[in-house]
């Protein structure tokens, strides 16, 4: 058993330009905590996977403000170190998640806001009982430096914390087959393997394969609180005899309370009143749970569905990320048809389709003529998405319910005089000009430049155009 | 200061539908997700569902999933309860909630006063 | 469905008096469960959100404890306005449930 320790040295804007905006102001004061989340191996295990090692909450740092103008400066930082309890071996490669988050300070109904900052991960090989290993991670804009370490709870020693030392029984040496413990060189390493199952909390051993309890415990595996009904006394240490407790410590004696958690006495036994991040009898659990308020953007938070996962967060649509942190590009996925182009309004997503489609994804391709009657003898054509009326003579409009004015367009050039015909128009052209739209002249030998006239027509007669 | 404003009562006839509203101000309506949930004279309370105003999404009680329909009107800041079928079951007091949210806080922080469904012919 | 089962149906007190109201879940609900007192003619009222978490506006007479099954909500010297019923919910999982809840009464 033992402790991995974080202390965090800075969190503040990284070197090179992009410099972040504080996320604090002087409308919405805030303050930084940080959340580590430790997982055994080297495996590239996702943000959501549950923290197999442990997890932690670090406290909150100073409310910080920021000043109008000024760059963001590392910010105020919490006191202490972050410490996650470890039960059995230390791996010697694991795996780590730093999150910062930032608690608004303003005037929030229903409590504080919290988003997330800035994730970093990483993988490393660490020997317990080292030294202070030394980190800079840049997540985007920001930088957060650290330092981390992993140490053995008395008795464990090694690079793993799974050999055991006590102190030496004779002063110049360890027992037959024994060596000294190093560092601890005055003390001896104890092979003991105490019985299989006995409660690390509530038991020892001073001998391979016994399991010795700590006062208040009994059965074979020190699990079973020694039993009070027969017993004059509630309280005390027991008697080998009776199993019964004598006049002595109350039920908050020791502190059962693991994690920092304050034990208070209740007619029953006791109670734990854990510190934020831990939660359970003892305060044994470690990790974010939903009254941490993890979940961002309209996430809603529910307990996990097996003992290992605290919260899950339901994200609304348009997020995703186990805080529901992160926002889905939905058009990335083209969910538009036909040409139609994406909208991503948050809210919802939107297709602006091209003509001639229609539906929330422009599924659907429109009959352009189907229910589409043209007026006045026109017929329908289809074409690009776009229904279209070609017209019969005399008519216009959309659906040729237009009597046309066919010299609306000035249609005769070269000064050509227009006359509305019943058949469509008739140009005059003047002098020096012929054609249907008066478009040729005629040349100063008395030829033209088409073929000559029709029968019956001289050059300069009105043209009528059909 | 948050409220959520509800009808008083609603007189209906076996067989047909009714539509509950509730009305919020004081706060970001769309931020925030509306619960509704039942009460029947003299006895405890039962979620029907929620749903977050910004995107329609719902969570719905399997109970009333053919019995309630809950929509929104973002413009006007309102919640709405569609109960189709009424038979004298459904006689009860229909109340609209406010969820923190927050943090993902699912915790109902604010009520309405309840609208009186009374189911008769 | 996890169901809340709350004890005492009813309590009897007079003003002064310190009381505990017991919830027990059928199932864990970790410390996603939260009170709420509701008066006669009246909308619930929330009065501890997660367990022990205090609500801005109520009075401090009113604490939560327990986890995972078991959970209290304490009236630390119990005031007139107290009397009415109060209610435990659990959001650990779908579908939200409500307990039957205590009614808290004038001796």
């Known amino acids: 058993a033992g402790v991995f320790e974080l202390q965090i040295h800075s969190f503040g804007p990284g070197p090179g330009p992009g410099a972040p905006r504080s996320p604090c102001s002087a409308r919405l004061p805030c303050r930084l905590f940080f959340r580590v989340c430790l997982k055994p191996g080297l495996s590239e295990e996702a943000a959501e996977s549950p923290c197999a090692l442990g997890a932690a909450l670090s406290a909150r740092g100073p409310v910080y403000t920021e000043q109008p103008g000024a760059p963001a400066p590392d910010l105020p930082l919490p006191d202490g170190l972050l410490q996650v309890p470890f039960r059995d071996a230390w791996p010697g490669t694991f795996s780590f998640i730093i999150e910062t988050w930032r608690e608004e300070l303003g005037d929030q109904i229903g409590g504080p806001a919290w988003s997330l900052l800035a994730r970093v991960a990483g993988r490393r090989r660490l020997a317990a009982g080292g030294p202070w290993a030394r980190d800079i991670q840049r997540a985007g804009a920001w930088e957060l430096r650290f330092s981390y370490r992993a140490r053995c709870e008395p008795p464990a020693v090694g690079t793993a914390c799974t050999r055991l030392c006590r102190p030496r029984s004779a002063p110049s040496r360890c027992g037959p087959g024994l060596r000294p413990c190093a560092p601890l060189e005055d003390e001896c390493e104890a092979p003991l393997v105490c019985r299989a199952g006995c409660s690390p909390e509530h038991g020892f051993c001073e001998q391979p394969g016994e399991c010795r309890c700590l006062e208040g415990w009994t059965g074979p595996l020190c699990t079973v609180p020694v039993s009070t009904s027969s017993c004059l006394s509630p309280r005390g240490p027991s008697s080998a005899t009776t199993g019964c407790l004598v006049p002595g410590p109350g039920p908050c004696d020791g502190n059962p309370c693991a994690n920092g958690g304050s034990c208070s006495e209740t007619p029953r036994s006791f109670e734990c009143t854990c510190p934020r991040g831990f939660y359970g009898l003892r305060c044994e659990v470690s990790g974010v749970t939903c009254a941490d308020g993890p979940c961002f953007n309209g996430g809603l938070c529910v307990g996990g569905a097996d003992p290992d996962s605290a919260y899950i967060c339901h994200c609304p649509p348009g997020f995703q990320g186990s805080n529901c942190e992160k926002r889905v590009d939905r058009c990335s996925l083209q969910p538009c048809r036909n040409g139609g182009l994406c909208l991503d309004l948050g809210h919802a997503l939107r297709c602006r389709c091209r003509a001639g489609f229609a539906g929330p994804r422009c599924e659907h391709d429109l009959d352009d003529c189907a229910g589409r009657a043209c007026a006045n003898g026109g017929t329908c054509v289809e074409g690009g998405g776009a229904h279209r009326c070609s017209c019969a003579l005399g008519f216009g409009g959309r659906d040729c319910r237009e009597r046309a004015d066919p010299c609306a367009a000035r249609p005769c050039a070269h000064g050509g005089r227009c006359y509305a015909h019943f058949s469509g128009l008739v140009c005059a052209c003047a002098p020096g000009y012929m054609g249907a739209r008066c478009e040729f002249p005629v040349h100063p030998d008395g030829a033209s430049a088409l073929p000559a006239a029709p029968p019956g027509l001289r050059p300069g007669d009105p043209q009528r155009y059909l | 200061q948050v409220q959520l404003q509800q009808p008083g009562a609603e007189l209906v006839k076996p067989g047909t539908s009714v539509k509950l509203s509730c009305k919020a101000s004081?706060?970001?309506?769309?931020?925030?997700?509306i619960t509704w949930v039942k009460q029947r004279p003299g006895q405890g309370l039962e979620w029907i569902g929620d749903i977050y105003p910004i995107s329609g999404s719902t969570n719905n009680n399997e109970k009333f999933r053919n019995k309630a329909t809950l929509t929104v009107d973002t413009s006007s800041s309102t919640a709405y309860m569609q109960l189709s079928s009424l038979t004298s079951e459904d006689s009860a007091v229909y109340f609209c909630?406010?969820?923190?949210?927050?943090?993902?806080?699912?915790?109902?922080?604010?009520w309405g006063q309840g609208t009186s469904v009374t189911v008769s012919s | 469905d996890i169901v809340l089962t709350q004890s005492p149906v009813t309590l009897s007190v007079t003003p002064g008096d310190s009381v505990s109201l017991s919830c027990r879940a059928s199932q864990s609900v970790r410390n996603n469960l939260h009170w709420y007192q509701q008066k006669s003619h009246e909308s619930p009222r929330l009065l501890i959100k997660y367990v022990s978490q205090s609500i801005s506006g109520i009075p401090s007479r009113f604490s939560g404890s327990g986890s995972g099954t078991d959970f209290t909500l304490s009236i630390n010297s119990v005031e007139t306005e107290d009397f009415g019923v109060y209610f435990c919910?659990?959001?650990?999982?779908?579908?939200?449930?409500f307990g039957a809840g205590t009614k808290l009464e004038l001796k």
């Open positions: 919910q659990q959001s650990n999982s779908w579908p939200l449930t």
């Open positions: 004081g706060y970001t309506f769309t931020s925030h997700w």
């Open positions: 909630a406010k969820i923190i949210t927050v943090g993902g806080a699912y915790v109902m922080d604010y």
